[in-house]
Interface confidence: low
C-alpha cells in the first residue's frame, strides 16, 4: 500500500580531500518510490553543467570539485566550510527531509602562530621549545624533528603538550636543530629550525672574568606597535641596560622574562631569549594583559655573568585578536540557542571577561545585542517566530569587544513548536549562503561599546534573553 517517504540513510558530515570526488548518500523508503532532490544551504541544486554536482541513480550525490566558497571573516586564509547538504525525498503523499550534512575542506595555513626560538640551556635544567602550529582544518597534529630526523619521544625525557616540546632534564646530546612539523590531510608545514645549545653547569673553578661584570637593567619600555608587522602585532618591549666592571666585554646578552605570579606563589620559570643588542634590544614573544618581570644576563663562552636587577612591566589588555570559534545556532524549546567556543589562548590579549552577541537586522529578530558575562559560552534567545535568525559573537576583554565572528544563520521555515520536535531537520549555515536575501548584513555591527558590561535589555513581541551557564 502507498506510504509517505521516510529517510533511511542520512548524509554524513565529511571532509573534501585531495582531488575528490566527495559522495553524499541518501536512501529513502516510500510507495510510490520517492524521487530524491538535493539542496545546498537550502537551495535546490541545478545539476546542470557546469554545476559540479551529479545525481547517481541510487540518490547518491557526487561532488566532482569543491564548490566556490565565500570570503573568510575570521582572519584565516581560507574558509573551510563548503556548505550544508540536505536531501529531500518526495512522492504524492509527502516529502521527507534528511538531516543536514556539512561538507568542509581540509586546510593548513602557511604561517606558524609561534615559531620555536633558539635556546640556550644548562645540563639538568628543564627546557621548553614552544611551537604554535599553523591554523588548520582538521586540527593539525604536531611532531618534532631534531637534526633532520624525527624525534623519538622517550617517556620521562620528552613530552609534547599543545604543540610545545618539553625536555624534563637537558642533556648534552639534546643540543641540535629542532623543527616543529604540523600535518593534516591538507599537507604539512615545517617551522624554522631552532638551535638548542646545552651548556655545562657553571664551574666557578674555571677563570670567569665575566663574573666581575655588573649589569644594571635601567629601563623596560613598551614599544609602539609596528604597522609593518600587520594589524595585530604582539607586544614588544625595549630593554636598556648598563654594564660596568673590570672584566672583558660580554659576547652576548640574554633576556630572562616571566609572568608575575601572585605573592607567595612559586615563581613561573624564566624564559630566555638571546638578545640582538649590546646596550639595548627589542624583545618580543610577550602577551597583552600580563604582568612581566624582566632581567638581563651577560655571557661569554661558557661563563655567565651575574643577572641584572629585575624590572616589572604591566602590558595593557587589548581587544581579542580573533573572534570566538565554532559559533552555532540551534532551535530550542521556544527559543534559539547560540553557543560558541572561546578564541584560542594566544588571541585573548588579556582576560576574556565575557562575550557580546549581536542579532542582525532584516531577519526575524530586530537588530539587538546582549552581553554574556564571565565564562559562559551560550545564550538562549526566547522566540516563537519562524524565519531566519542571524547572529555574530565577539569576545570582550578589559579593552573592549574584539572582532565579531562570521555571521551564522538559522532558517526556521515552520512554527517553532514543530522545529523543537524535529531539531535535526535544520542546521545552521553562514550568512554567505543567505546573501541574496540578506545582502545588507555584510556591513556587520559597529564595535564601539561605551561600557563593555552594560547589559542591554531588548524587548520585542514576547522575546526574552536568558543567560545559560555552559558546563
Amino acid at each position: 500500500q502507498d506510504s509517505p517517504p521516510q529517510i533511511l540513510v542520512h548524509p554524513q558530515d565529511q571532509l573534501f580531500q585531495g582531488p575528490g570526488p566527495a559522495r553524499m548518500s541518501c536512501r529513502a523508503s516510500g510507495q510510490p518510490p520517492p524521487t530524491i532532490r538535493w539542496l545546498l544551504n537550502g537551495q535546490p541544486l541545478s545539476m546542470v553543467p557546469p554545476d559540479p554536482h551529479h545525481l547517481l541513480p541510487d540518490g547518491t550525490l557526487l561532488l566532482l570539485q569543491p564548490p566556490a566558497r565565500g570570503h573568510a571573516h575570521d582572519g584565516q586564509a581560507l574558509s573551510t566550510d563548503l556548505g550544508v547538504y540536505t536531501c529531500e525525498a518526495s512522492n504524492r503523499l509527502g516529502t521527507a527531509v534528511s538531516r543536514g550534512a556539512r561538507l568542509s575542506v581540509a586546510v593548513l595555513r602557511e604561517d606558524f602562530q609561534i615559531q620555536p626560538r633558539d635556546m640556550v640551556a644548562v645540563v639538568g635544567e628543564q627546557l621548553t621549545l614552544e611551537c604554535g602550529p599553523p591554523w588548520g582544518h582538521p586540527e593539525p597534529t604536531v611532531s618534532w624533528w631534531k637534526d633532520g630526523k624525527p624525534l623519538v619521544l622517550q617517556p620521562g625525557r620528552y613530552t609534547v603538550s599543545g604543540g610545545s616540546l618539553l625536555m624534563a632534564r637537558a642533556e648534552k646530546s639534546d643540543a641540535g636543530a629542532y623543527m616543529c612539523v604540523a600535518a593534516n590531510s591538507a599537507g604539512h608545514r615545517e617551522s624554522r629550525a631552532a638551535r638548542v645549545s646545552i651548556q655545562e653547569p657553571q664551574d666557578y673553578t674555571e677563570p670567569v672574568e665575566l663574573l666581575a661584570v655588573r649589569i644594571q637593567l635601567e629601563n623596560v619600555t613598551l614599544l609602539n606597535p609596528d604597522p609593518a608587522k600587520g594589524p595585530k602585532p604582539g607586544p614588544a618591549v625595549w630593554l636598556s641596560w648598563k654594564v660596568s666592571g673590570p672584566a672583558a666585554p660580554a659576547q652576548s646578552y640574554t633576556a630572562l622574562f616571566r609572568t608575575q605570579t601572585a605573592p607567595g606563589d612559586q615563581g613561573a620559570p624564566w624564559t630566555e631569549e638571546l638578545l640582538a643588542g649590546w646596550q639595548s634590544a627589542e624583545l618580543g614573544g610577550l602577551h597583552w594583559g600580563q604582568d612581566y618581570e624582566f632581567k638581563v644576563r651577560p655571557s661569554s663562552g661558557r661563563a655567565r655573568g651575574p643577572d641584572s636587577n629585575v624590572l616589572l612591566l604591566r602590558l595593557p589588555e587589548k581587544v581579542p585578536s580573533a573572534p570566538p570559534q565554532e559559533v552555532t545556532l540551534k532551535p530550542g524549546n521556544g527559543s534559539v540557542l547560540v553557543s560558541w567556543v572561546p578564541p584560542s589562548a594566544e588571541n585573548h590579549n588579556g582576560t576574556i571577561r565575557g562575550y557580546q552577541v549581536w542579532s542582525l537586522g532584516n531577519t526575524s529578530l530586530p537588530p539587538a545585542n546582549w552581553t554574556v558575562v564571565g565564562e559562559q559560552t551560550q545564550l538562549e534567545i526566547a522566540t516563537r517566530m519562524p524565519g531566519s535568525y542571524c547572529v555574530q559573537v565577539a569576545a570582550v576583554t578589559g579593552a573592549g569587544a574584539g572582532e565579531p565572528s562570521s555571521p551564522v544563520c538559522l532558517l526556521l521555515e515552520q512554527a517553532m513548536e514543530r522545529a523543537t520536535r524535529e531539531p535535526s531537520e535544520h542546521g545552521p549555515w553562514t550568512l554567505e549562503q543567505l546573501r541574496v536575501d540578506l545582502e545588507v548584513l555584510f556591513q556587520g555591527p559597529g564595535s564601539g561599546l561605551n561600557d563593555i558590561f552594560e547589559a542591554q535589555k531588548i524587548e520585542w513581541h514576547e522575546a526574552r534573553a536568558h543567560h545559560h551557564h555552559h558546563h
Epitope: 638551535r195 660580554a250 627589542e282
Partner: antibody, heavy 119, light 115 residues
Framework: QIQLQESGPGLVKPSQSLSLTCSVT?????????WTWIRQFPGNNLEWMGY???????DYNPSLTSRISITRDTSRNQFFLQLESVTTQDTATYYC????????????WGQGTMVTVSS | QPVLTQSPSASASLGASVKLTCTLN???????IGWYQQHRDKPPKYVMF???????SKADGIPDRFSGSSSGADRYLTISNIQAEDEAIYFC?????????????FGSGTHFTVL
C-alpha cells in the same frame, strides 16, 4: 628553505649613492633573525656592514655609520642597503645574509652582486 | 674589537688531513668564532661554530670530515680525508661587543689548495 637574492645597479659613479635590494623567500623577515649586509672586496676580505632585525632594530659597522642606511619593506619581504658618497674603495661584491641560529653566524647567503664604483 | 689572524695559504694532498688556524688577539681569546668556506664565484658557506672551550656545532650538510677545536686563543678547522671539492678559501668570523659597539669581524681568509 630560506633564499636571499640581491639586486641593484652594477655600476655607480663616485660621490653618488649605492642602493641594493635583498629579496627573501621561504621566511618572513618580520618573523625572526637579523637581516644583514656583508661585502667582499676584490682582495677577498669580508666586511660586515650592518643589519636590520626582524623587529626593526638596526646596528651598523662603526666605520660606515655616517653613510649607511638599512631599511626594510615587510609587505614585500625585502630589505635594502643605501650607501652614500661612494668612492672606488666601495667597489666590492655585496651579499645579503642571515643567521639561522647564533646571531652572527650566517647560515644563509645571497649569491652576491658585484658593484663597481667608477666614473 | 677582536682581530682574527689567518695564514694566507695552506695546502695538502688528496686523502690527507689539514688543520687551519684562526688566532684571536689576547684580549678576546675566549671568544667563539664561525668558520666559512668559499668556492670561486660563490658566496661564503657557513661550516661550523667553534667555542672557546673547543666545543663545535656543524651546519647542516657539512660532512663528518670537518671538525673544530680550540686551544687558548687559537680556533681550528680540521679537514680529514681531503677531497678535491674542499679546495676553497676558508674564513673565520667573530662577533664582538666593545664599549657598546657591536659588530662582526672576519679574518683575511686562508686559500686552501688540494695537491
Amino acid at each position: 628553505q630560506i633564499q636571499l637574492q640581491e639586486s641593484g645597479p652594477g655600476l655607480v659613479k663616485p660621490s653618488q649613492s649605492l642602493s641594493l635590494t635583498c629579496s627573501v623567500t621561504g621566511y618572513s623577515i618580520s618573523s625572526g633573525s637579523l637581516w644583514t649586509w656583508i661585502r667582499q672586496f676584490p682582495g677577498n676580505n669580508l666586511e660586515w656592514m650592518g643589519y636590520i632585525s626582524y623587529a626593526g632594530g638596526i646596528d651598523y659597522n662603526p666605520s660606515l655609520t655616517s653613510r649607511i642606511s638599512i631599511t626594510r619593506d615587510t609587505s614585500r619581504n625585502q630589505f635594502f642597503l643605501q650607501l652614500e658618497s661612494v668612492t672606488t674603495q666601495d667597489t666590492a661584491t655585496y651579499y645579503c645574509a642571515t643567521p639561522g641560529g647564533y646571531p652572527f653566524h650566517f647560515d644563509y647567503w645571497g649569491q652576491g652582486t658585484m658593484v663597481t664604483v667608477s666614473s | 674589537q677582536p682581530v682574527l689572524t689567518q695564514s694566507p695559504s695552506a695546502s695538502a694532498s688528496l686523502g690527507a688531513s689539514v688543520k687551519l688556524t684562526c688566532t684571536l688577539n689576547s684580549q678576546f681569546s675566549t671568544y667563539n668564532i664561525g668558520w666559512y668556506q668559499q668556492h670561486r664565484d660563490k658566496p661564503p658557506k657557513y661550516v661550523m661554530f667553534v667555542k672557546g672551550d673547543g666545543g663545535h656545532s656543524k651546519a647542516d650538510g657539512i660532512p663528518d670530515r670537518f671538525s673544530g677545536s680550540s686551544s687558548g686563543a687559537d680556533r681550528y678547522l680540521t679537514i680529514s680525508n681531503i677531497q678535491a671539492e674542499d679546495e676553497a678559501i676558508y674564513f673565520c668570523g667573530a662577533d664582538y661587543n666593545n664599549a657598546g659597539q657591536y659588530g662582526c669581524v672576519f679574518g683575511s681568509g686562508t686559500h686552501f689548495t688540494v695537491l
